[in-house]
């Protein structure tokens, strides 16, 4: 699990690969804070509930992202 | 060198099942996700999905969901590319690209495997 | 998903000419345009990324351009072994595409 215990960061390592969208639980992005100086975005998995911590800066994720979005506005009102 | 080489050509009947593989070499094999594409004879490329090397978890597009799978041996770095039910309009070389995730784009390809659909 | 038209389909030339090759997007894609060469019996093979980006020994006769959904790709001074068919491809979007191709002959 790609996770710290430390009071700075969440994520240790990151991945530059990305998911299928309709396999995410949820996908939170932690914007760069006192704590902690870079954006972080973490994604549980639906199977298992297992969380991965995602590139921010990698095409292929930036590209999730943008697909996750459209799928919330098609399904919102 | 970064290498995928893809096994050989394949000529199945209508019906049965082909396996195609895909072993890479000079990179780390969960390092980058693996794409499909195909080619039917004297057509263009088709992008057919991709598999996250890391987890194992394909995705297909719209035209390859159902009958296609996509798997993953680590142990071997190898992908591979399950096609079922072969019909003739399958007769096509399919190619597995390594992406270049950071920067979206696939840089390097296997040679590809033809797969011969005849009765 | 993002549709790619890319046009002529089919091209004659002469040694030492110009060639262009265009790829118009079904929206905009943010320079996320890349550029195969695909020689027959091989496998594609990358030339740019990025609408411009070169890669690492392709030859500088070959360049790309564009923005917003209109992109180009130009040899400057074909060359025998540029016989080939040309891709454009689309990365913007999880959902890749691909150009019809252009096919490439000697006058």
């Known amino acids: 699990v790609p996770l710290s215990r430390t009071v700075r960061c969440t994520c240790i390592s990151i991945s530059n690969q990305p998911v299928n969208p309709r396999s995410l639980e949820k996908l939170e992005i932690i914007p760069a804070s006192q704590f902690c100086p870079r954006v972080e975005i973490i994604a549980t998995m639906k199977k298992k509930g297992e969380k991965r911590c995602l590139n921010p800066e990698s095409k292929a994720i930036k590209n999730l992202l943008k697909a996750v979005s459209k799928e919330r506005s098609k399904r919102s009102p | 060198e970064v290498q995928l080489v893809q096994s050989g050509a394949e000529v199945k009947k209508p019906g049965a099942t082909v396996k195609i593989s895909c072993k890479v070499s000079g990179y780390t094999f969960t390092d980058y996700s693996m794409h499909w594409v195909r080619q039917a004879p004297g057509k263009g490329l088709k992008w057919m999905g991709w598999?996250?090397?890391?987890?194992?978890?394909?995705t297909y597009a719209d035209d390859f969901k159902g009958r296609f799978t996509f798997t993953l041996d680590t142990s071997t770095s190898t992908a591979y590319m399950e096609l079922s039910s072969l019909r003739s309009e399958d007769t096509a070389v399919y190619y597995c690209?390594?992406?270049?995730?950071?920067?979206?784009?696939?840089?390097?390809w296997g040679q590809g495997t033809t797969v011969t659909v005849s009765s | 998903d993002i549709q790619m038209t890319q046009s002529p389909s089919s091209l004659s030339a002469s040694v030492g000419d110009r060639v262009t090759i265009t790829c118009k997007a079904s929206?905009?894609?943010?320079?996320?345009i890349a550029w195969y060469q695909q020689k027959p019996g091989k496998a594609p093979k990358l030339l740019i990324h990025?609408?411009?980006t070169l890669q690492p020994g392709i030859p500088s006769r070959f360049s790309g351009s564009g923005s917003g959904r209109d992109y180009t790709f130009t040899i400057s001074s074909l060359q025998p072994e540029d016989i080939a068919t040309y891709y454009c491809l689309q990365y913007d979007n999880l959902l890749f595409t691909f150009g019809q191709g252009t096919k490439l002959e000697i006058k």
């Open positions: 929206q905009d894609i943010n320079k996320y």
């Open positions: 690209a390594r992406n270049y995730d950071y920067d979206g784009y696939f840089d390097v």
């Open positions: 598999i996250n090397t890391e987890i194992g978890e394909p």
């Open positions: 990025y609408t411009s």
